[in-house]
């Protein structure tokens, strides 16, 4: 009685269960009653990452330097190449097919998380007591100057974009 279903890592063809090809190999010829499935390793620039019956291996991803990409991890016969972005750039999507420059945090905002090759800069508003007066992809919000520790007094209040201005205390006559 011909099978209607096959075991794991097998496939049904012409009423027969054949072994799938292991990761890193492609199908050359289905099995017969007499012969095992014929598989062939993927070439150097190709891969297959699952047990399969593919007759063609997939091309490794190309990390195009013109798009700001560089190789993070070289592909093998079983894995695809992983691309990342050059310094100062990050991926536009999870699949990292192109890169864009990291955004800077505007004055009044500081860097919460510095950008990586795969994620953009995360900015946060400077809370009370902190400020940022520059547009930067690296600088965090800085605390207002403590006039008191310098034996000075606040002459001008700080904002999220400006530091306090300290001045000498008025001397009592």
């Amino acid at each position: 009685e011909p099978p209607t279903a096959c075991r794991e890592k097998q496939y049904l063809i012409n009423s027969q269960c054949c072994s799938l090809c292991q990761p890193g190999q492609k199908l050359v010829s289905d099995c017969t009653e007499f012969t095992e499935t014929e598989c062939l390793p993927c070439s150097e620039s190709e891969f297959l990452d699952t047990w399969n019956r593919e007759t063609r291996c997939h091309q490794h991803k190309y990390c195009d330097p013109n798009l700001g990409l560089q190789v993070q991890q070289k592909g093998t016969s079983e894995t695809d190449t992983i691309c990342t972005c050059e310094e100062g750039l990050h991926c536009t999507s999870e699949s990292c097919e192109s890169c864009v420059p990291h955004r800077s945090c505007l004055p009044g905002f500081g860097v919460k998380q510095i950008a990586t090759g795969v994620s953009d800069t995360i900015c946060e508003p400077c809370p009370v007591g902190f400020f940022s007066n520059v547009s930067s992809a690296f600088e965090k919000c800085r605390p207002w100057t403590s006039c008191e520790t310098k034996d000075l007094v606040v002459q001008q209040a700080g904002t999220n974009k400006t530091d306090v201005v300290c001045g000498p205390q008025d001397r009592q006559r």
Epitope: N14, S29, D30, T32, E33, F34, T35, E36
Partner: antibody, heavy 117, light 109 residues
Framework: QVQLVESGGGVVQPGRSLRLSCAAS????????MHWVRQAPGKGLEWVAV????????YYADSVKGRFTISRDNSKNTLYLQMNSLRAEDTAVYYC??????????WGQGTMVTVSS | EIVLTQSPGTLSLSPGERATLSCRAS???????LAWYQQKPGQAPRLLIY???SRATGIPDRFSGSGSGTDFTLTISRLEPEDFAVYYC??????????FGGGTKVEIK
Amino acid sequence: QVQLVESGGGVVQPGRSLRLSCAASGFTFSSYGMHWVRQAPGKGLEWVAVISYHASSKYYADSVKGRFTISRDNSKNTLYLQMNSLRAEDTAVYYCARDTSRGHDIWGQGTMVTVSS
Amino acid sequence: EIVLTQSPGTLSLSPGERATLSCRASQSVSSSYLAWYQQKPGQAPRLLIYGASSRATGIPDRFSGSGSGTDFTLTISRLEPEDFAVYYCQQYADYPPFTFGGGTKVEIK
């Protein structure tokens, strides 16, 4: 490279025996089924027998059933055809061929068997 | 047993001409398991076409196969001097036996 080489042919009297061998190289012999196919002088191809890669399945043409036995030794990468009770009509070139789902993709050069008194 | 009948028995043609060889089965054959072989004098057969229409590795594209069911055809679009040989069809769907056709000889006219 992938190669099959037959040997063991010769002239033999009717009723006698002969054993043909087929030496395989250049591929994983133990993964492939193997066939014997013969060709009488001036005639077409006639399939003789097949054996599976693990030797558990064997089939024969009606014309040789009960007289011929196909076998293999995977440790020696060799296929055999034991031919008993030979008849004049068994005179032919005997080829071994590799089994695939694409047909017989590799053939040996053949060995001549002549059954004559 | 599936009987394969090839026609014509002999085909006399000149180089550059088109050759059309026929193989007819006594009952329906799965096209996945119909092959064509070429054999030259003193040589072993060589696999040309498998699965009725797929060319084997290294076979020039002037060779093509077609057909299904009981009627199959091997076509050589433009005969080259090295194509003059005997051609056999074979079915390996229904066995035993694995059956061959009687062959078609393509000779120089």
